[in-house]
Structure formats: C-alpha cells, structure tokens
C-alpha cells in the first residue's frame, strides 16, 4: 500500500508516457489520475515499468473499478494482466473475442496459468457455449484445451465447432471426453465421402461404438494401429477377426506387436483360435477349437 502524498509541483501526469518510469512509487500514486490511466491503458504495455510500479497502477484501477474493470480497460492490460489474480478476473465480464486474444497473447507459448484458466471460464460462460471462433482461438493458443474440459462442459460444444479441432487437440483426451465428442464429430462430418470422412473422424474414434467400427470395416479405411489402440475396449471386443482384418487392412500385421496390450489382448481372448490363425500372424490366446462360447454379459442381462 502506497502512502497518500501530494504530487510535487510540475509532476502531475498529463498523459501516460515513458517519462513515468522515472517516477517513484509514491509519485505514481500521487501524480497519475486513475481515469487518465484507464483511458490510456493501451500505452502502459509499451512502457517498461517494473512490476512494483505496475502494482501501483493496478491499485489505482482497483480503486476506480471496485466491481471489476470494464472491457475497454481489460483489452489493453497487456503485461499488467500477469499481475491479476483469479479473484480479480472473476469480477470481469469479457464478451469480445478480441479481448480474449489480446490477453492470451501475453501468455502465448506457455502453459495455461490460473489467470488464463479463469479468464477462459468467464468468457465461455458469458457466451453460453463454446462456438467455433472461440474454440479456434483457444486451441490455437492451447492445443490441449479441449481435453481440459469435463464431459459436461464438452456437451456445450456445438457440432459446427468440431471443424476447428485438429488431431493434436485431442491427444490428451480420455475415453469419457471422446464419448461426448465423437457423436458431435459424426454429425459434423456426416456429408463427407468415405476416405475424407475417415481422415476427419479418425482422431475422435476413441468414442466410437461397435456398430460404427463395423460400418468402417466395410469401407477399406486401413486404420493405423495407433488409432486402433485408442479405441474403446468394449467397442472392439464384439468385432470378428474378419472385421478387424478389413478395418486395419495392411496394418493388421501390427497386431502381433500389440498382442499383450489392450484392447488387442482382450479382443484375442474373445476370438476362436481357428479364426485368429487365418491371419497368419501367430496370435495366441484365442478360444480353443470345440469350446462353447457363452456370452455371460447377455446371460446376466436376462437373469
């Protein structure tokens, strides 16, 4: 807290300019008018103030706007944004995508800070949904953003926004998140032809049900092993050997290297060894010939 002292004669700031870096903290407090600061915030970022000095300027803005800063000030905070606490940011009402971009730029190229997380939360809540332009912006700055949302939050993503999603944006998504995103992607890409559709939907397939995987197996898609390994185990288990062979195409040979890992391991345990042998890959662990297969899950459902 800076002591209230009178501004020395001739030092009253008439504009926010570089001469202010030569002001001591108490001079900034005494000689810079908060309203002037608010109208000329865009200049502050171009002046190499110390954060100690910026603290004084922040204090002046806090006094002027105790209920939270107006967007005209927020948009021009620049490096002063890095002095804001999440509590400060929760008071803001940020509606302009330009404001969001300006503040994300300050944090660019680095992990999401608590301030940025709060800012994004305020912005998205204010908009009511995660529209395409917002998603475009957020994933450009933070590729992992989508996967940081809960399934409930993801449910507000309209299918049209899915076009903004790049494969790397989904790298850290878990199955619960993909369960929500996959139906939206399916809807978004439904009018595309076979090969184009597969290219777009591929990253979302970790949320695909069995019937969709069966349908894909009829389309010569040649799914790579990395994608196959990310499929839901419960969606893979009902697939036949023939369906998996068609789904993977030339990549089917990769099953051997993955036979100890899910979902391949669990799928092998559900197939007849005879059928597995037709692949010629030496996959072991299938059901021996002559054994009866009981679907216990079906039996439990009936009892």
């Amino acid at each position: 807290e800076v002591e209230k002292t009178a501004c020395p004669s001739g030092k009253k700031a008439r504009e926010i300019d570089e001469s202010l870096i030569f002001y001591k903290k108490w001079e900034l407090e005494a000689c810079v008018d908060a309203a002037l600061l608010a109208t000329q915030m865009d200049r502050v970022n171009a002046i190499p103030f110390t954060y100690e000095q910026l603290d004084v300027l922040k204090h002046k803005l806090d006094e002027l706007y105790p209920q939270g800063y107006p967007e005209s000030v927020i948009q021009h905070l620049g490096y002063l944004f890095l002095k804001m606490s999440p509590e400060d940011i929760r008071k803001w009402n940020v509606t302009s995508l330009e404001t969001l971009k300006a503040l994300l730029e300050v944090n660019k190229g680095h992990e999401m800070s608590p301030q940025v997380a709060t800012l994004i939360d305020r912005f998205v809540k204010g908009r009511g949904q995660l529209d395409k332009d917002t998603l475009d912006t957020l994933t450009a700055f933070y590729p992992g953003y989508l996967c940081s949302l809960s399934p409930e939050e993801l449910s507000s993503v309209p299918p049209s926004s899915i076009w903004a999603v790049r494969p790397q944006d989904l790298d850290t998504c878990d199955p619960r998140q993909l369960d929500v995103l996959y139906p939206k992607a399916r809807l978004a890409f439904q009018n595309m032809n076979g090969s184009e559709y597969f290219v777009k939907i591929q990253s979302f397939l970790g949320g695909a049900p069995t019937e969709d995987l069966k349908a894909l197996s009829q389309q010569n898609v040649s799914m790579d092993l990395a994608t196959f390994m990310k499929l839901r185990t419960d969606a893979v288990l009902p697939l036949t050997v023939a369906e998996v062979q068609k789904l993977l195409g030339p990549h089917v040979e990769g099953l051997k290297a993955e036979e100890r890992h899910r979902p391949v391991r669990d799928w092998i345990l559900r197939q007849r060894q005879d059928d597995l042998d037709t692949l010629g890959l030496g996959l072991q662990g299938g059901i021996p010939n002559g054994y009866l297969v009981l679907d216990l899950s079906m039996q439990e459902a009936l009892s």
Partner: nanobody
Amino acid sequence: VQLVESGGGLVQPGGSLRLSCAASGSMFSINAVAWYRQAPGEQREPVAAMTSGGSTIYADSVKGRFTISRDNAKNTVYLQMNSLKPEETAVYYCYAQGYDYDEGYGMDYWGQGTSVTVS
C-alpha cells in the same frame, strides 16, 4: 532466475565502460529490460530501459552518451557508457520484467549489481 552483471570497474572521467547482464535459469518470459543505478546514500533510479518491442528510453542526464541493447540469442543485456562523469559513480543494477510460472505472476528480477567508479 539469475541476472548476473559484469563489466564494472574504475574508469577515468570521460572514459567508457560496457556493462553486461546475463540471464540464466528458467524464466517464463522477459518483457522489458533496464539498467538502474544507485549512488551512495541515494535511491535506486532508472538509467536506460528497453521494451519488448525494442523501444529505448533514457534518463535525460545520459541521453546521447549511454546505449542499452539486448541480444536475445545470448539472453544478455548491455549498457554502453561513454563520456562518464564522476557523479555517475554508483552500483549499476540489471533489471528484467518477467513472469515466474511457479508463482503464476509477473515478477521483477534484479541482478546483484556491479560497481562503477569514475575517478
């Protein structure tokens, strides 16, 4: 984060010195950089500063004689001081306006200072 100054020493009036400040450690980012000085019994005051965009600002008393520069590849800031005067005897401090990700806030970083004596 550490800022380490070097290049200080004893110089005759009218002489020149070049101060260097090397930044090391993991810093989130550096925005502005500056040189400050503190004469015996005085408060620390800015001498020269540079914004992230490369604009430079000088105290009136050093304009035309001092030059601040920055080599981003070497993480180093320089202060070229020419036509030095006895009253410029002081400890010169390097300053960086940065961001500490661990703290989650913008931070002021200061070097330990390098002594310049003009006599």
